[in-house]
Interface confidence: medium
């Protein structure tokens, strides 16, 4: 807290300008009118204030707007936004996409901070829905934001947003989310040629159906084991040994190290042992020769 002291004669600020950097903290508190500061917030970002001085300016705004800042002030906070706590931001009502963009720009290049997460939450609640413009903006700044959305929310993500997604941004996505994102990625990258397409689609393949994996196996893609291990088990099971061999290319040798883990373990159990033997990897656990394979799911469907 800054002590309340009278402003020295002749030091009353008539505008927010660079002369204020020469004011001590108590002078800023005493000589800068909070309403003037609120109307000239955009100027603060052009002036080399210290952290301590910025704290005083924030304190003045807090006193002026104890219930939360109006959007006209929020939009021009600039780097003062980084001084706000999540508790401050929870008092705001942010409805303008321009305001959201202005504040996300401040934090650009950094991980999503608690302030930004709270801001986004307030914005979405203020708007009442996650429209495409909002999602486009959020995924442009934080591609990883996709994985924090529910499958229902993801359904309104425009395929164009997928272009900004980096592989690491999908690390926290679960299979249900990838089920929604994969068709969008497939649409977004559909005009790319084989090898370029595979590079882009690779991180989304956790949502790919069997038929798409079969198609990829015909394109010499040489999928790495890390990607293969993230595929849906139900999509991998129907693949033949020959298809998996083509899909993985030289990486097929890695199956041996993963034979006890899903989806490789479950896939092995579905293959004929003599087919597995053709790989020459010593994979064990396949269906012995001469055994009849019953598809129980088909049997249940018929009964």
């Amino acid at each position: 807290e800054v002590e309340k002291t009278a402003c020295p004669s002749g030091k009353k600020a008539r505008e927010i300008d660079e002369s204020l950097i020469f004011y001590k903290k108590w002078e800023l508190e005493a000589c800068v009118d909070a309403a003037l500061l609120a109307t000239q917030m955009d100027r603060v970002n052009a002036i080399p204030f210290t952290y301590e001085q910025l704290d005083v300016l924030k304190h003045k705004l807090d006193e002026l707007y104890p219930q939360g800042y109006p959007e006209s002030v929020i939009q021009h906070l600039g780097y003062l936004f980084l001084k706000m706590s999540p508790e401050d931001i929870r008092k705001w009502n942010v409805t303008s996409l321009e305001t959201l963009k202005a504040l996300l720009e401040v934090n650009k290049g950094h991980e999503m901070s608690p302030q930004v997460a709270t801001l986004i939450d307030r914005f979405v609640k203020g708007r009442g829905q996650l429209d495409k413009d909002t999602l486009d903006t959020l995924t442009a700044f934080y591609p990883g934001y996709l994985c924090s959305l529910s499958p229902e929310e993801l359904s309104s993500v425009p395929p164009s947003s997928i272009w900004a997604v980096r592989p690491q941004d999908l690390d926290t996505c679960d299979p249900r989310q990838l089920d929604v994102l994969y068709p969008k990625a497939r649409l977004a990258f559909q005009n790319m040629n084989g090898s370029e397409y595979f590079v882009k689609i690779q991180s989304f393949l956790g949502g790919a159906p069997t038929e798409d994996l079969k198609a990829l196996s015909q394109q010499n893609v040489s999928m790495d084991l890390a990607t293969f291990m993230k595929l849906r088990t139900d999509a991998v099971l129907p693949l033949t040994v020959a298809e998996v061999q083509k899909l993985l290319g030289p990486h097929v040798e890695g199956l041996k190290a993963e034979e006890r883990h899903r989806p490789v373990r479950d896939w092995i159990l579905r293959q004929r042992q003599d087919d597995l033997d053709t790989l020459g990897l010593g994979l064990q656990g396949g269906i012995p020769n001469g055994y009849l394979v019953l598809d129980l799911s088909m049997q249940e469907a018929l009964s």
Partner: nanobody, 115 residues
Framework: VQLVESGGGLVQPGGSLRLSCAAS????????VAWYRQAPGEQREPVAA???????IYADSVKGRFTISRDNAKNTVYLQMNSLKPEDTAMYSC???????????WGQGTLVTVS
């Protein structure tokens, strides 16, 4: 972001020095910069500042003697100090505001001794 000041040293009263503050990182040209000084046993005080728009301002004690400037191509801000006085003796540091999501970066400082 790193700030490296240089150019300090021992100078006689009435002499001149040119301090430099080199900043690593991009977006230098759109940020506000300032020089501060701290004399032994005193609080740090601003000496000269330049806004992101390029306007400059000086402490009354150095007006007409000190000049702040910048070279965006070199990511460097300068402080030309003329007619130096013993009371200008201090550690001079630059502050480089609002780069990459931070408010301010301070350099380690360069010592100016007028004696």
């Amino acid at each position: 972001v790193q700030l490296v000041e240089s150019g300090g040293g021992l100078v006689q009263p009435g002499g001149s020095l040119r301090l430099s503050c080199a900043a690593s990182g991009s977006m230098f040209s759109i940020n506000a910069v300032a020089w501060y000084r701290q004399a032994p046993g005193e609080q740090r005080e601003p000496v000269a500042a330049m806004t992101s728009g390029g306007s400059t301002i000086y402490a009354d004690s150095v007006k007409g003697r000190f000049t702040i400037s910048r070279d965006n191509a070199k990511n460097t801000v300068y402080l030309q100090m003329n007619s130096l006085k013993p009371e200008d003796t201090a550690m001079y540091s630059c502050i480089y505001c609002r780069y990459d999501g931070e408010f301010a970066y301070w350099g380690q400082g360069t010592l100016v001794t007028v004696s």
